[in-house]
Interface confidence: low
């Protein structure tokens, strides 16, 4: 069964910067990746970035840079707005559309006790079944 993993890191050198890493574990080719925060895409979440393997990437503030790391994983750098640190306890979700499997989505957040720059990869928690 395909799975999506999500890892959120606070940058050690820049405490207002966060990076979301997402990956797809499964067969098939990725046709689209959507990263949202505050909940799953289209159901309470706010879209931060869309990455298409051929058409390129689109991102919205506070996303700073979205990029492919491998053919099945992406990273998204975020710039926090300041003192309120909204990202610290926010849920980030990554949705991978894969052909022919369908869509798979998982969410993750910064571990509450994590030191800057350190974050153990969480166990994937699928939020939605295949669309």
């Amino acid at each position: 069964t395909p799975e999506v993993w999500v890892q959120v890191q606070m940058e050690a050198t820049e405490l207002s910067s966060f990076t979301v890493h997402c990956g797809f574990l499964g067969p098939g080719s990725i046709s689209l990746v959507t990263v949202s925060w505050g909940g799953p895409d289209g159901a309470g979440g706010t879209k931060l970035a869309v990455l298409h393997p051929e058409l390129g990437t689109r991102q919205w503030a506070p996303a700073r840079q979205a990029r492919w790391e491998t053919q099945s994983s992406i990273s998204l750098a975020l710039e926090d707005s300041g003192a309120s640190s909204p990202f610290a306890n926010t849920t980030f979700c990554c949705k991978f559309a894969s052909f022919p499997e369908g869509s798979w989505e998982s969410c993750g957040s910064l571990p509450p006790s994590s030191d800057p720059g350190l974050s153990a990869p969480p166990t994937p928690v699928p939020i939605l079944r295949a669309d």
Epitope: A43, T46, R129
Partner: antibody, heavy 119, light 106 residues
Framework: EVKLVESGGGLVQPGGSLKLSCAVS????????MSWVRQTPEKRLELVAK????????NYPDTVKGRFTLSRDNVKNTLYLQMSSLKSEDTAIYYC????????????WGQGTSVTVSS | DIQMTQSPASLSASVGETVIITCRAS??????LAWYQQKQGKSPHLLVY???TLVEGVPSRFSGSGSATQFSLKINSLQPEDFGTYYC????????FGGGTKLEIK
Amino acid sequence: EVKLVESGGGLVQPGGSLKLSCAVSGFTFSSYTMSWVRQTPEKRLELVAKISNSGGSTNYPDTVKGRFTLSRDNVKNTLYLQMSSLKSEDTAIYYCTRYSWDVYAMDYWGQGTSVTVSS
Amino acid sequence: DIQMTQSPASLSASVGETVIITCRASENIYSYLAWYQQKQGKSPHLLVYNAETLVEGVPSRFSGSGSATQFSLKINSLQPEDFGTYYCQHHYGDPTFGGGTKLEIK
């Protein structure tokens, strides 16, 4: 042409139930998040429910959580809003809206259906 | 929830005038803001999204601006069809709407 046509509104007593429907045409229904927005007699707008394109995930504000249930039939191209334990403050015009993932806003609205909760 | 405060609640203007409607968010919403127009007896329709992007087909006399917590909708050279009620809406998490601004003919 995109069309959203609501039905099912009417007069209901407090504590009663009502089911609204929204028949959709002119776009690939199964590709879009859909939502219901209501407009109170004071003309305030409030999002009451949102559902993902597959129907697998829904979202409600606290004002209606536990009382309203949003569902969709992607074969019939229809959106449903089951409302129960209705209160007088639920009196409003209810609009079915398409929630565009591209602009993250409601880019198409139906004509609305009126719900009056009164004894 | 993020609160959206619109001002003024109502205003009167003449055809040909320029008007500005403002919307303030209770916290930083970056550029996640939309504007809608509603005419009497009709449903709202989307004018502007992402704070400043005009929906295709919306006349260029409309313009949106702002970011973070302060936003505005400017209508240059008002036309008779521009009168109605305008709403802002944030889409930063769970969306909420402003209270509306009723634009009337003077």
